[in-house]
């Protein structure tokens, strides 16, 4: 493979590598394709030791526009030379290539979470996978944002060990009978744009005082 040819056409694919639920997911979008591919095949090699391109087994002849590379791409030091081939039936429509370096190219999707509202606190249950590879920890910290009446408060819970298994955080000292919204995201040690989760909102139940006041009426 020649990696350093001076003639380049504008790539016809846009790639994105994301850490989604602590899995390395490569996704792609096509630019200006009149014929939409029926399936794709993804191949790669390591740039420091270029060998024949290896087909990613679970992404050969796939109809999906993403590929889970967690078990293939294990190093945050290597650059992975990636080739995406698009087919319509037996005809090759296009081939796009790009090099990925996980340490700098990875974006971090927010974890799944649930909230349960109580009178004066909210339980935030963040779902992490039971086991997370050391290479995929990426020096990340969990951020929980609490919003109410235009005021945003950031919580940075300390997680002992690595981010694995379910994690519960309590946002306390809240005001009963008030609407609160919560968003979670993973913050990288670098100045990288964060991807925040959609807000989940709950109206806290009224407290004891307002309950007794209501019953007295």
């Amino acid at each position: 493979i020649s990696y350093d040819s001076p003639d380049y056409t504008d790539e016809s694919c846009t790639f994105k590598i994301s850490l989604r639920n602590f899995r390395s997911i490569l996704s792609w979008e096509l630019k200006n394709h009149s014929i939409v591919p029926t399936h794709y095949t993804l191949l790669y090699t390591i740039m420091s030791k270029p060998e024949d391109l290896k087909v990613v087994k679970n992404c050969a002849n796939t109809t999906r526009s993403f590929c889970d590379l967690t078990d293939e791409w294990r190093s945050t030091h290597e650059a992975y030379v990636t080739v995406l081939e698009g087919f319509s039936g037996n005809t090759t429509l296009f081939s796009c290539s790009h090099n990925f370096w996980l340490a700098i190219d990875m974006s971090f999707e927010p974890p799944e979470f649930e909230i349960v509202g109580f009178t004066n606190h909210i339980n935030v249950m963040v779902k992490f996978p039971s086991i997370v590879e050391e290479e995929l920890q990426f020096d990340l910290s969990l951020v929980i944002e609490e919003q109410s009446e235009g005021i945003v408060k950031k919580h940075k819970p300390e997680i002992k060990g690595n981010m694995s298994g379910n994690f519960t955080y309590i946002i306390d000292k809240l005001i009963p009978n008030t609407n609160y919204c919560v968003s979670v995201y993973l913050e990288h040690s670098d100045e990288q744009a964060v991807i925040k989760s959609p807000l989940k909102c709950t109206l806290l139940p009224p407290g004891q005082e307002s309950e007794s006041a209501e019953s007295a009426k």
Epitope: Y3, P6, M47, S75, A79, H98, S107, Q192
Partner: antibody, heavy 117, light 112 residues
């Protein structure tokens, strides 16, 4: 042959900012990350940081956060580094260097920045 | 940050004689992927740095085989079997295992 062409020398007053450039040619620019390295007599070589030429993601050496800002313009295959609030300590030669993963393989010719009143 | 310490500061060698430069890191440079991202650069007078060796012992293309890199963990060595006039300049070791990447202070090779 791969080339990293850096902008010319800069003589600047203390307190101002300077933006230096590094244009990559004869290779696919967005396939390689771009690093910036400072070389001064006092401190030998110091790694400032790295930018993803495809996504624009950055990673800085803590020491240079707030001092250096790295950006990239894919359309012109050019990486930039702006140095803010310059002092005499910032007088140095600044190199760009490309990498594939953790492998730095080519360096620019360097840009000399002299801070003097 | 990892500190890279190079010795000697200056090395004065006769053409045709061997030379050896030591580089020590304050922490192990062996990564969890099994590789050691220890590299050597040469900066000739008035030029920008050029890669000589990467991954402890792999020579960059065009680098003569009189250069050898060795070592593991925290202790590394660059050896030149027979020094030639074109070898003069400053040699730097640097590590890319841990961010921020860090460089040694340099060793100036002079020709006697």
């Amino acid at each position: 042959e791969v080339q990293l062409q850096q902008s010319g020398p800069e003589l600047v007053r203390p307190g101002v900012s300077v933006k230096i450039s590094c244009k990559g040619s004869s290779y696919k620019f967005t396939d390689y990350a771009m690093h910036w390295v400072k070389q001064s007599h006092a401190k030998s070589l110091e790694w400032i940081g790295v930018i993803s030429t495809y996504y624009g993601n950055v990673k800085y050496n803590q020491k240079f956060k707030g001092k250096a800002t790295m950006t990239v313009d894919k359309s012109s295959s050019t990486a930039y580094m702006e140095l803010a609030r310059l002092t005499s300590e910032d007088s140095a030669v600044y190199y760009c260097a490309r990498s594939y993963g953790s492998y730095l393989d080519y360096w620019g010719q360097g840009t000399s920045v002299t801070v003097s009143s | 940050d990892i500190v890279m310490t190079q010795t000697p500061l200056t090395l004065s060698v006769t053409i045709g004689q061997p030379a050896s430069i030591s580089c020590k890191s304050s922490q192990s440079l062996l990564d969890s992927d099994g590789k050691t991202y220890l590299n050597w650069l040469l900066q000739r007078p008035g030029q920008s740095p050029k890669r000589l060796i990467y991954l402890v012992s792999k020579l960059d293309s065009g680098v003569p085989d009189r250069f050898t890199g060795s070592g593991s963990g925290t202790d590394f060595t660059l050896k030149i079997s027979r020094v030639e006039a074109e070898d003069l300049g400053v040699y730097y070791c640097w590590q890319g295992t841990h961010f921020p990447w860090t460089f040694g202070g340099g060793t100036k090779l002079e020709i006697k």
